[in-house]
Amino acid sequence: MNGSEYFVKIQSFLGGAPTEDLKALSQQNVSMDLATFMKLRTDAVLPLTVAEVQKLLGPHVEGLKAEERHRPVRDWILRQRQDDLDTLGLGLQGGIPNGYLVLDLSMQEALSGTPCLLGP
């Protein structure tokens, strides 16, 4: 069974998938469509790297642009370095500026909804 066939079988169960499952899926050439990606739990999407999301979505990655202001895409973008987002060539904006340090202060983030940044 190839990645696409596997994805079709598990698609309806993905809404509650944890980050670990999404990371594993990204290695299986599933080419997740954006409609499915938008239904994923925000907390499961946030830890994914740009490379992992690119692999997870495959050719559908260009669809991130159209949804960049909708959750979970919006919140995921806020967590990525702008340099990394730029590698996608989609014109995604809102990433962490170059030279900034991300502090993983869970309390700060829980209160503000965004990561704590220290300037250069």
Epitope: D33, L34, K65, A66, L90
Partner: antibody, heavy 119, light 108 residues
């Protein structure tokens, strides 16, 4: 057949609100966002915002400054656009238009709803 | 916001002639994020072209699109009577999404 059927024409007084509906049929409702675009008499097209029917997430054009609200009823495959604090310049035809999630173009449009704001 | 300026505002041509419509953006638009719509009087807009040059379903091959950066073009190779309408370009490269002011193609 894919269809978007909108509610009928409305006449409203300045300061009132209007709620326009758009009923979708012939496709998987949650695979497409629904956008709203308006057109004042003799004018061009203006994008108002969109809603993701699957999550209820919305994005609005800042021009409407909190006056627009978009909602959905998945069980009825219907989206709604409410515009409040109406003024004469809100007189326009309001269109719903579907947009496949992950794309930015509108491949099917409703027939339009004429909203007239007049004292 | 990105302002899309369409020119000319009105194009007077005869059936069989070639129509060239221009859409100029106030700042660069990624070509994948530009589309064209046709609107006839009393009707809803209809998608013609997406991603600058891809024909929408059911659109005849006499329509074509091209361009990049700030300059985009819609071409109708040989006008048919049903092509006389208003044409709008639309960008979703930058928020808020915007439309051009339209070009009316009328019968000469």
């Amino acid at each position: 057949e894919v269809q978007l059927v909108q509610s009928g024409a409305e006449v409203k007084k300045p300061g009132a609100s209007v709620k326009v509906s758009c009923k979708a049929s012939g496709y998987t409702f949650t695979d497409y966002n629904m956008d709203w675009v308006r057109q004042a008499p003799g004018q061009g097209l203006e994008w108002m915002g969109d809603i993701n029917p699957s999550t209820g997430g919305t994005i609005y054009n800042q021009k409407f400054n909190g006056r627009v609200t978009m909602t959905e009823d998945k069980s009825a495959s219907t989206v709604y656009m409410e515009l409040s604090s109406l003024r004469s310049e809100d007189t326009a035809v309001y269109y719903c238009a579907r947009r496949r999630i992950g794309t930015g173009y509108f491949d099917v449009w409703g027939q339009g709803t004429t909203v007239t704001v007049s004292s | 916001e990105i302002v899309l300026t369409q020119s000319p505002a009105t194009l007077s041509l005869s059936p069989g002639e070639r129509a060239t419509l221009s859409c100029s953006a106030s700042s660069s638009v990624i070509s994948s994020y530009l589309s064209w719509y046709q609107q006839k009087p009393g009707q809803s807009p209809r998608l013609l072209i997406y991603r600058t040059s891809n024909l929408a379903s059911g659109i005849p091959a006499r329509f074509s699109g091209s361009g990049s950066g700030t300059d985009y073009t819609l071409t109708i190779s040989s006008l048919e009577p049903e092509d006389f309408a208003v044409y709008y370009c639309h960008q979703w490269s930058s928020f808020p999404y915007t439309f051009g002011g339209g070009t009316k193609v009328e019968i000469k």
